[in-house]
Structures are given as C-alpha cells and as structure tokens.
C-alpha cells in the first residue's frame, strides 16, 4: 500500500465565520521538513505555500483575501515531504458573514431567569431565508440551527447555570453565507441555591484558542507539538 | 427608574373596541416581553397575554385570542391592547406588566374600561 | 391551563399574628409559584418569586415554601400596613395563572 504522512491540522486563525470584503486566514499545520502545502477548496486545488526554510517550521498560513460567498464553504489541506504526501485533513467550513440584513434576536421568558425555567431563543429576519444559526460566544462551533420563514424558535429546555452567557443568531442564505450577527442577548441564569444572577463566566475553551500554533524550531520544539496536539484533541 | 403608564379609563357601548396603551420607560424596551393582564371588579387577575416588542411576536391566553389584539410602537416604547366585540364582563381594569426579572415585577397603574349601554 | 386554587379566601387577624395562606396548584408548577401584594385601587406588588426568594425591598417577614402542588406564604408577624389581597400565581407553563385570593383584615 502507498505510504502517507499523517493528516495535517487544518484552522481559521481567530475565527471560521469571516465578514465579506474581510481578510480569512487558514492555518495549515503539518511537520517540520514539509516543503510544499496545498489548500483545497470544494476538493480543487486553490493555492499552495512553501514555508522557507521548510526543516524549520511546522506549517504554514493561507491568506484569503476579499471573502465572499463564492470563497465560502469547505477547506482542507496537504503537505508533502519530499515525495511524500500526507493525508487530507479534517474539512474545515469556512463562513461569509455580513450578508445582506441583522437579525432580532430575543429570549423569552426574559434575559434573567431561574435555573430549571424553559427558555426559547426567537431569531427573526425579515428578508428571504429559511435557515437561522444561534451561538453562544466562546462557543461559536455548538452552532444550534433551526428553520422558519421570517422567525425560527430555539427552545433550550429547562436551563442551567451552564446555560448562561451572551447569544448572537444569524439568518443563512446556505451554509456557508450568513447574515450580519444580530445584536447579542446576555443570558442570565440564577441557580437553585444562590440569590444571585451570575453573570457569564469564561468558557471552558474559550475561541481564542482558534489561533494558529505554528511554531519555528527550538528546543522547545517538542513540547510545543505535543502541547498543541493535546489543545487540538482538547477542542475536538 | 423603569415606569409603565397607562393610558386613562375608558367608557365603551357592547359592540365597541377599545385600545389600552402603555407608555415604557427606564430600560430596554424591545428587551423584555410586555404582559397584559385583566381584573374584573372585586375579582381575581387574569393573564390575556404576551407580546415581545423586539419581534412582535405574540402568546395569548385562549380565552382572549379572538378579541384581543397585542401590538407596540417600537418607536414611541408603547405598548397596545386592543380588546373588540365588547361586553358587559369586559368591564375591568387592564394592566401592563412586564417581567424584568423573575416575575411580573413592574406593572402600570391599571387602565379602567367600563362597558356600558 | 393549570387551576391555582388559594385558601381561605379571606382571613382577620390581630396585629403581631403570623398569618399563613395556601395556594394548590392543578399539577405539578415545578416551584414556579410567585406571591403577590394588592392594595385597593393600585396595581399589583411582587412580594416572592420561584416559592420561596424575596423580591428585592420586601420585608423579612414575608417568607415562601411549598413544593410539587402545593404551596405556602407565610407572613411571620403581621402589620397594619400588610392589610391587602394576596394572591399566587404559577409561572410554569403559559398561560401563567393566578389564584382568587386573600383578602387579609385587622381584627
């Protein structure tokens, strides 16, 4: 069987939802020694980079300029070593934000409520779309979907403490083409034992862990790989 | 300070509508869904229903979601209640209300709508 | 719709006297059970909410407990000025329904 380099890390520096006319950068990480990476869109080819010098760093970034919604939708990348070439990473949906109108998002029964109420986020948009997205910020790949004419209802159940936190919701054109972000509703959950409203905390895994760790080699070189071997494995 | 203040009482023939505003102040109007409830003399407190002035979306209790119409006026932070077909039992005070924090917590000083031939 | 049914519908008691009213709900209300305050000719004050919490600026003596149905609101030692109607309402399932409540008088 023809041998193959594992499958590289593929992600979106900062964040995968990208505003039109914006910069998106994807992050390629593969292995020291790599001398060319490949960034494949839909499954073509769309651009190549060759890190200089290859032995020395451990991906590389593709740049895309002016976003779109003809450049949203699914990345991957390759690398080779020599004439090795490694498997096809993991497909990464990269989004076009700032399409078209801003949603209203709203929470009933109210933005403060007590642990165990039922909660229903409403997202409504006026304009021609069937799809509404609702996210949680530091939360931003748990993307709940629902469908509707002009409003989609997100019933959340009876809510906890874990619950609390700001939501954003958008209205999608497809998949990969949302509108503005509406504006974000603080959701307040107090416990059953506390008195008081506890405002959001950090989450777990916060986005700004969607950054590119690509690192230049030192002695610290192995530790970092493993480190972000285990932060990847972590988000995942 | 968040006030609710409802428009003055109203004497209407059976048959007639009415139309009960109130007038929002002191937080986010388009935040917080506004209650209407009903209470007829020496009675007990009725929940009519719910708009939500950030969409207008809208619950109505059963019992008055064929003569009763929730609307607002984002632009002046007001809310409506109109109330058609009216009855003799339809003589009450009307209350807005809303739900700021845990419960109805704020409500307008009651709007008193007499019907009468 | 769940029925909210408050007893007794009117009570006298003395200055001082602890007061208790109950209210049983037609099903389980999961402690979504509020307690409010009306005083002749004025709109309706929030004294408790989810059973048991004081709403903010509410005396100590007011006090809420109850589970599943059924459901207490308890007035520690009454005072002149917590002359009023007193009723319950559930606020698990909509539409959001009240008791017929209390008249509370001084003896």
């Known amino acids: 069987p023809k041998q193959t380099l594992p499958k590289p890390i593929i992600r979106a520096e900062s964040t995968y939802m990208v505003p039109k006319e914006k910069q998106a950068t994807l992050c390629c990480q593969g292995s020291y020694g790599a001398v060319e990476y490949q960034l494949h869109f839909e499954g073509s080819l769309f651009a190549v980079e060759r890190p200089k010098p290859p032995e020395r760093i451990n991906g590389v970034k593709f740049h895309i300029p002016d976003m779109n919604s003809r450049k949203a939708g699914r990345y991957s990348c390759i690398y080779r070593v020599g004439e090795l070439w490694s498997e096809r990473s993991d497909l990464l949906d990269l989004v076009v934000t700032e399409m078209y109108d801003t949603p209203t998002l709203s929470v009933h029964p109210g933005p403060e409520v007590t642990s165990g109420e039922k909660v229903t986020f409403y997202c409504r948009l006026d304009t021609a779309t069937s799809m509404f997205l609702l996210l949680k910020e530091g939360r931003s790949r748990d993307v709940q979907r629902s469908y509707g004419k002009v409003q989609a209802e997100f019933p959340m159940g009876p809510v906890t403490t874990a619950h609390r936190g700001s939501y954003r919701c958008f209205g999608s054109y497809n998949n990969y083409a949302w509108s503005f972000p509406s504006e974000p509703v603080k959701l307040l959950v107090t416990g059953d034992i506390e008195n008081t409203s506890l405002a959001p905390t950090d989450p777990t895994f916060p986005d700004s862990w969607d950054t590119c760790l690509l690192t230049r080699e030192t002695g610290l070189q192995k530790d970092l790989a493993l480190w972000d071997h285990t932060a990847q494995n972590l988000l995942r | 300070q968040v006030q609710l203040v409802q428009s003055g009482a109203e004497v209407k023939k059976p048959g007639a509508s009415v139309k009960v505003s109130c007038k929002a102040s002191?937080?986010?109007?388009?935040?917080?869904?506004m209650h209407w409830v009903k209470q007829a003399p020496g009675q007990g407190l009725e929940w009519i229903g719910e708009?939500?002035?950030?969409?207008?979306?809208?619950n109505y209790n059963e019992k008055f979601k064929r003569r009763a119409t929730m609307t607002v006026d984002k632009s002046i932070s007001t809310a409506y209640m109109e109330l058609s077909r009216l009855r003799s039992d339809d003589t009450a005070v009307y209350y807005c209300?809303?739900?700021?924090?845990?419960?109805?917590?704020?409500w307008g000083q009651g709007t008193l709508v007499t019907v009468s031939s | 719709d769940i029925q909210m049914t408050q007893s007794p519908s009117s009570l006298s008691a003395s200055v001082g006297d602890r007061v208790t009213i109950t209210c049983r709900a037609s099903?389980?209300?999961?402690?979504?059970l509020n307690w409010f305050q009306q005083k002749p000719g004025k709109a309706p004050k929030l004294l408790i909410y989810?059973?048991?919490r004081l709403h903010s600026g509410v005396p100590s003596r007011f006090s809420g407990s109850g589970s599943g149905t059924d459901y207490t609101f308890t007035i520690s030692s009454l005072q002149p000025e917590d002359i009023a109607t007193y009723f319950c309402?559930?606020?698990?399932?909509?539409?959001?329904?009240f008791g017929g409540g209390t008249k509370l008088e001084i003896k």
């Open positions: 099903q389980d209300v999961r402690n979504f």
């Open positions: 209300a809303i739900r700021l924090r845990f419960a109805l917590d704020y």
């Open positions: 708009i939500n002035p950030g969409n207008g979306g809208t």
């Open positions: 989810f059973t048991s």
């Open positions: 309402q559930q606020g698990n399932t909509l539409p959001p329904t």
């Open positions: 002191g937080y986010t109007f388009t935040t917080y869904w």
